[in-house]
């Protein structure tokens, strides 16, 4: 008898009653497996359930496939042994007899697996599409809600204006929009959503309460509030919205009148610095991050804003890569690659009268309030708003001039009634936009302060001389820690030393201006500058401490600025005639530090504590300060430029070159210290009372150097 398969473990041997078992056993098992997929219907519920069911089915099929392949392998072996003349036992023979069946099953299982895999992919695609659709819908809803909040805050803000109140009471065509009681209700509600600073509460707690009120209003809840319900208040507010009162022409829109825009357009060409710096390497790498820039579109001259572009009214995130690239390709003077002490020395400037005239021209061109988002909306600590979901617009590539780094905010009184000792106010003071091209990766560590509004009347909270004090820059500390990562930098909240002011200005050397990040890229037209000595600066309106990685081998001499001449004016522009508004970048990132881009230290003006009724000019900018975690808190911090930061990338932050990436936005450390106040709009001049007792804090309460715990 041929040598049997007795030793080959694969076979099953049956000489006695050799079992036809192979088939019976294993086939049965296979059958059971095969049945499994049928019973595992893909769940029709949520995507997750479907995916899970599909996984299970695929798992069963996969297991079945493996079993069949294993079995087929055995059968092949049996057959081979049979061919060699070896005897198989009954189980093996039974198995071999099932060879065709196993082969067919295997093919079927493979086909089944392919089908289910395709189905699984389809399901995944569908789930992703659905999720994306849902996400978009959620974002849309969030956006709508945010828009509503902004509208609501705008309306509530506007109700501080007597003229608006009167108009709403009289109504359009004699039909009143709001009654006196309804106005009072809204006034009461305003106090809840725009509360006076309560020092017994942490800021985020206070705004948490405020946000709950806003939320309940948006929901139109039946809960009682201010002697009525949120639902009633919502109806009142909706009535105001529907009246379209604020859409009509008597409203002072943010931006320039047409003739002003037309007049300011030529200024663009003149804005390009005529200095001849060695251009740094252009940074042209396309940013992969969908970034968002904050641009006050209405603030641009018409020639600069390409009206042909689709206005992205409802799109909140806008790719600005092309813009960024086009801006980055402007020649930039390379700054010396050695970190220098933060001292700025004076630069001879043109005739004071000429300079003053220039500034006034500049201000005249930039009339009109900014219609920016309330800071309360930006207090992300207790809200689920995505920081990227804030009205954004790409900058127009044609705007490649550097923007002035100064703000000339008007003075706002604490109450709606004019204060006797206010500094004279130009009714239409202007703001020049600040450029923010900073990174979170590196945070310059100058001491940070909360500069108070220079002329704001704060009832005996602090002496006016201290308010107007210029805060000197602590150079030692800055230099020492400038190359430290944000987390390791000291947080400094110290009152600035009082120095005599030149022309009531705030010294641009002051730490808040140098180390705080500015908020918006507002592409405002800037008047032409003709003085050659002024234009010889690296960039006329460059970010202070223009930190750049330059590939330039030699150091470029930085023009020195006189400390006295670096003053940004508070209130109306009282700057001495020789002020230059220029902060030349001479603080460089040390070349060896390439772990994160330095925070561009830009002048920063705190214009938040504007009380209602003041001149509206200063609404545009939002302040920030450093909290205990050394994270910059305030105005939209969290912009991360997505650029290569190699030392020779030639990236200078003064040009609007960094696309903003919100991916790393740490919401939890972010708190706005100030909400912007809403001064009275446009050329209405003096603050208005609200009829009856003054509501001192309809704008924002003043808070100075308050550290949030």
């Amino acid at each position: 008898m041929p040598s049997a398969t007795s030793h080959s473990g694969s076979g099953s041997k049956s000489s006695g009653p050799p079992p036809p078992s192979g088939s019976s056993g294993s086939e049965a098992a296979a059958g059971a497996g095969a049945a499994a997929p049928a019973s595992q219907h893909p769940a029709t519920g949520t995507g997750a359930v479907q995916t899970e069911a599909m996984k299970q089915i695929l798992g069963v099929i996969d297991k079945k496939l493996r079993n069949l392949e294993k079995k087929k392998g055995k059968l092949d072996d049996y057959q081979e042994r049979m061919n060699k003349g070896e005897r198989l036992n009954q189980d093996q023979l039974d198995a071999v007899s099932k060879y065709q069946e196993v082969t067919n099953n295997l093919e079927f299982a493979k086909e089944l697996q392919r089908s289910f895999m395709a189905l699984s992919q389809d399901i995944q695609k569908t789930i992703k599409k659905t999720a994306r659709r849902e996400q978009l819908m959620r974002e849309e809803a969030e956006q709508k809600r945010l828009k509503t909040v902004l509208e609501l805050q705008y309306v509530l803000d506007k109700l501080g204006d007597d003229e608006v109140r009167t108009d709403l009471k009289q109504g359009l065509n004699g039909v009143p929009i709001l009654s006196e009681e309804e106005l009072s209700l809204l006034d009461e509600f305003y106090k809840l959503v725009d509360p006076e600073r309560d020092m017994s509460l942490r800021l985020n707690e206070q705004y948490e309460h405020a946000s709950i009120h806003l939320w309940d209003l948006l929901e139109g809840k039946e809960k009682p509030v201010c002697g009525t319900t949120y639902k009633v208040l919502k109806e009142i507010v909706e009535r105001v919205f529907q009246s379209n009162y604020f859409d009509s022409t008597h409203n002072h829109q943010n931006g320039l009148c047409e003739e002003e825009e037309a007049a300011s357009a030529p200024a663009v060409e003149d804005q390009v610095p005529e200095a001849e710096p060695e251009p740094a390497e252009e940074y042209t790498e396309q940013s992969e991050v969908e970034s968002t820039e904050y641009v006050n579109r209405q603030f641009m001259a018409e020639t600069q804003f390409t009206s042909g572009e689709k206005e992205q009214v409802d799109e909140w995130t806008v790719e600005t890569v092309e813009v960024v690239n086009s801006l980055q390709q402007q020649p930039q003077a390379a700054s010396p690659s050695v970190p220098e002490p933060h001292s700025l020395t004076p630069v001879a400037q043109a005739d004071p009268l000429v300079r003053r005239q220039r500034v006034q021209d500049l201000m005249a061109q930039m009339q009109g309030p900014y219609n920016f988002i309330q800071d309360s909306m930006l207090d992300f600590e207790n809200q689920t708003l995505d920081p990227a979901i804030v009205s954004a617009q790409p900058m127009n590539p044609t705007q490649n001039m550097d923007m002035p780094q100064l703000v000339c905010p008007p003075v706002h009184s604490e109450s709606r009634l004019a204060q006797p000792n206010q500094v004279p106010v130009q009714p239409e003071a202007t703001q020049v936009p600040l450029v923010s091209s900073t990174s979170e990766g590196y945070t310059a560590s100058q001491p940070l302060y909360q500069p108070s509004h220079a002329t704001e009347q704060r009832p005996q909270k602090e002496p006016i001389d201290q308010i107007q004090a210029t805060i000197s820059l602590n150079t030692d500390q800055t230099t020492a820690s400038s190359s430290l990562p944000a987390a390791s930098q000291p947080q400094v909240f110290q009152a600035g030393t009082s120095k005599p002011l030149h022309s009531s200005g705030i010294n641009v050397n002051a730490a808040p201006f140098q180390s705080m990040q500015t908020v918006f890229n507002m592409n405002a037209p800037v008047p032409p500058v003709n003085e050659p000595e002024t234009l010889k600066q690296q960039n006329q309106y460059q970010a202070s401490y223009n930190q750049s990685f330059s590939s330039q081998p030699h150091q470029v001499e930085q023009t020195e600025l006189q400390q006295e001449q670096l003053q940004t004016v508070v209130g109306t522009y009282h700057g001495s005639p020789d002020q230059s508004h220029q902060v030349t970048g001479n603080h460089q990132q040390p070349p060896q530090q390439n772990t994160g881009f330095p925070r561009s230290n830009q002048p920063y003006y705190n214009s938040r504590g504007v009380s209602r009724g003041g001149s509206r000019g200063a609404r545009g900018l939002m302040n920030g300060y450093r909290g205990p975690a050394n994270g910059f808190r305030g105005g939209y911090d969290g912009y991360r430029p997505s650029f290569s930061n190699t030392p020779n990338s030639g990236y200078t932050q003064s040009q609007f070159s960094a696309p903003r990436d919100y991916s790393g936005y740490q919401r939890d450390g972010y708190q706005q210290n100030f909400k912007r106040g809403s001064g009275q709009s446009g050329p209405r001049g003096a603050p208005r009372g609200r009829g009856g007792p003054p509501r001192p804090n309809r704008g924002m309460p003043q808070m100075n150097t308050q550290q949030v715990n």
Epitope: A4, S12, S15, G16, P17, P18, P19, S21, Q90, L93
Partner: antibody, heavy 114, light 112 residues
Framework: EVQLVESGGGLVQPGGSLRLSCAAS?????????MSWVRQAPGKGLEWIAY????????AYANWAKGRFTISKDNSKNTLYLQMNSLRAEDTAVYFC??????WGPGTLVTVSS | DIQMTQSPSSLSASVGDRVTIKCQAS??????LAWYQQKPGKAPKRLIY???NLDSGVPSRFSGSGSGTDFTFTISSLQPEDIATYYC??????????????FGGGTKVEIK
């Protein structure tokens, strides 16, 4: 229905002979099967006797069965046989035929007694 | 001939108990082993083939393991209908090295 039915059992005197048959239905003897005979004495365990491979007629026997017992098949009749000679009292048992070791007949009783 | 030794020859257990039966071959038979259940007056019924493969229709409380010379049969949770005698059998094809399809002596399982 696939089944096996044994026949030919009964009372036989010691030293006598008996031929057991196992009729297969539901399947053909032309397949690849081992057909076996197994017996079980009253109150005792199972005891394998012999098998034949239907395909080529190869046989194997338990040592104790060699010489006295012969396994055979008739493909045309689909029948398996067990020829028992020189029966002894200890051969008294129920005799089962089996296809492989999965399918069994109900058995037929063989009693060897004088 | 190959010899199969089964132990214990009988056992008594309670319903729900785990029951284990051993079978030892006189020489290595790889995994060529089957386990049978036989109830009085009936033909044996194969439960396990190739040492560990469960026949179709057999409850999963029955299982087999082992290879070479030592094999184990287990009833994970004894049920009243499991009262029977259990046998092991070498199922190798007879050859010069392994001869015969010998059965073990059987194990009678009873309920306490």
């Amino acid at each position: 229905e696939v089944q096996l039915v044994e026949s030919g059992g009964g009372l036989v005197q010691p030293g006598g002979s008996l031929r057991l048959s196992c009729a297969a239905s539901g399947f053909s003897f032309s397949g690849s099967y081992y057909m076996s005979w197994v017996r079980q004495a009253p109150g005792k365990g199972l005891e394998w006797i012999a098998y034949i491979y239907i395909g080529d007629g190869v046989t194997a026997y338990a040592n104790w069965a060699k010489g006295r017992f012969t396994i055979s098949k008739d493909n045309s009749k689909n029948t398996l046989y067990l020829q028992m000679n020189s029966l002894r009292a200890e051969d008294t048992a129920v005799y089962f035929c089996a296809r492989g070791n999965k399918l069994w007949g109900p058995g037929t009783l063989v009693t060897v007694s004088s | 001939d190959i010899q199969m030794t089964q132990s214990p020859s009988s056992l008594s257990a309670s319903v729900g108990d785990r029951v284990t039966i051993k079978c030892q071959a006189s020489q290595s038979i790889s995994s060529y082993l089957a386990w049978y259940q036989q109830k009085p007056g009936k033909a044996p019924k194969r439960l396990i083939y190739d040492a560990s493969n469960l026949d179709s229709g057999v409850p999963s409380r029955f299982s087999g393991s082992g290879s070479g010379t030592d094999f184990t049969f287990t009833i994970s949770s004894l049920q009243p209908e499991d009262i029977a005698t259990y046998y092991c059998q070498c199922t190798a094809v007879s050859s010069a090295t392994i001869y015969g399809n010998a059965f073990g002596g059987g194990t009678k399982v009873e309920i306490k």
